[in-house]
């Protein structure tokens, strides 16, 4: 039942996580522009993985896509990378715990298939979440290198003075939606797995007893009881019987006077 | 990167009429808002007018009723038609644009100046 209770909690936790990783990937506040302050109106600058956006105050908002001849830095290709092999991922992750669930029945699936597709997702939704921290981290690291070198420079141009203002850009509420998306995915990748071992068939032999019925009665070929959830020959739990009560290591002997009851 | 250039400046008489241009070019996603300020010899540079990228725009009051700022988006350049001219608005005039152009980049760029003298 706790690892029906697991598996379960773990899904749902990942399935919140890539839901949030995938809002986060397509949201537009990764980075937010401080407020230009102007007597009339404040306009404001917020940008994603995908396009740059303008707003202002009177509710006017211009959207653009970034293009080639912005000639986009490495860092951003490497973030959207990372971003898309995140929900991939996580996507998979999701299809294969689905069949995985202990509480789903597909079949005669057994509880080994099913052991092995829950740790196959858990370690999909580990990648996944990983890879969205990852990603999520890097740009935020960009911002942090960006505001500390955006400081007022001046230099002189043709015909005066000409002064350039750099404007800071600080964390949208893309990258703490990001950042809580990952580690949820990562939690649920981390409860699978652990469900996995919940679920995972152990092979417990018990040293099996054989019993000897009189001297006349046919002799069955010694065989164990096997505590078994599908693993190896005795799959049906059957106690094997060889007539008298000797254990399977000591030397097999004929019935004896001793054998009657 | 991003580079502002001013035009349409010079001698005009009093009561006639200006047309000043400014472009920005350069890699522009957006260029938020663009405007005028001015600086007469001695004085403090002081804002003449601007415009967002949405349309709002804001005056001097000095200016309120005379002068007329206008732009075009797709080509990134502001408008200032200057109409009543009196010998109080000799200055340099200065076009000033707030522009995005990269990834978290951006900031506020002043174009070089134009003279525009009024002789009584």
């Known amino acids: 039942m706790a690892v029906t209770a697991c598996q379960g909690l773990g899904f749902v936790v990942s399935l919140i996580g890539i839901a949030g990783i995938i809002a986060a990937t397509c949201m537009d506040q990764w980075s937010t522009q401080d407020l230009y302050n102007n007597p009339v109106t404040a306009v404001f600058n917020y940008q994603g993985l995908w396009r740059s956006c303008v707003r202002e105050s009177s509710g006017f908002t211009e959207c653009r896509g970034y293009f080639t001849l912005l000639g986009l830095p490495a860092m951003l290709q490497a973030v959207r990378a990372l971003m898309i092999v995140g929900i991939v991922l996580g996507a998979i992750g999701l299809l294969v715990s689905i069949f995985a669930l202990k509480c789903i029945r597909i079949g005669s699936m057994e509880d080994s298939a099913k052991a092995n597709m829950t740790l196959t997702s858990g370690i999909m939704f580990i990648v996944s979440g990983l890879c969205a921290i990852a990603g999520v981290s890097v740009f935020a690291n960009m911002l942090v290198t960006n505001f500390w070198m955006s400081t007022a420079n001046m230099y002189t141009g043709m015909g005066g003075m000409v002064q350039t203002v750099q404007t800071r850009y600080t964390f949208g509420a893309a990258l703490f939606v990001g950042w809580v998306a990952g580690g949820l995915t990562l939690i649920g990748g981390v409860m699978m797995c652990i469900a996995c071992r919940g679920l995972a068939p152990e092979e417990t032999n018990y040293k099996a007893v054989s019993y000897h019925a009189s001297g006349h009665s046919v002799a069955y070929k010694p065989g164990g009881f096997k505590a078994s959830t599908g693993f190896g020959s005795n799959t049906k739990n059957k106690k094997i019987y060889d007539g008298g009560a000797r254990t399977e290591d000591e030397v097999q002997s004929y019935p004896s006077k001793h054998d009657y009851v | 990167q991003v580079k502002l250039e001013e035009s349409g400046g010079g001698l005009v008489q009093a009561g006639g009429s200006l047309g000043l241009s400014c472009a920005a070019s350069?890699?522009?996603?957006?260029?938020?808002?663009m405007g005028w300020y001015r600086q007469a010899p001695g004085k403090q540079r002081e804002l003449v007018a601007t415009?967002?990228?949405?349309?709002?725009?804001n005056y001097a009051d000095s200016v309120k009723g005379r002068f007329t700022i206008s732009r075009d988006n797709a080509k990134n350049t502001v408008y200032l038609q200057m109409n009543t001219l009196t010998p109080g608005d000799t200055a340099v005039y200065y076009c000033n644009a707030d522009v995005v152009y990269g990834l978290a980049r951006s900031g506020n760029y002043w174009g070089p100046g134009t003279q525009v003298t009024v002789s009584s």
């Open positions: 415009q967002t990228i949405g349309g709002t725009t």
């Open positions: 350069g890699t522009i996603l957006h260029v938020m808002v």
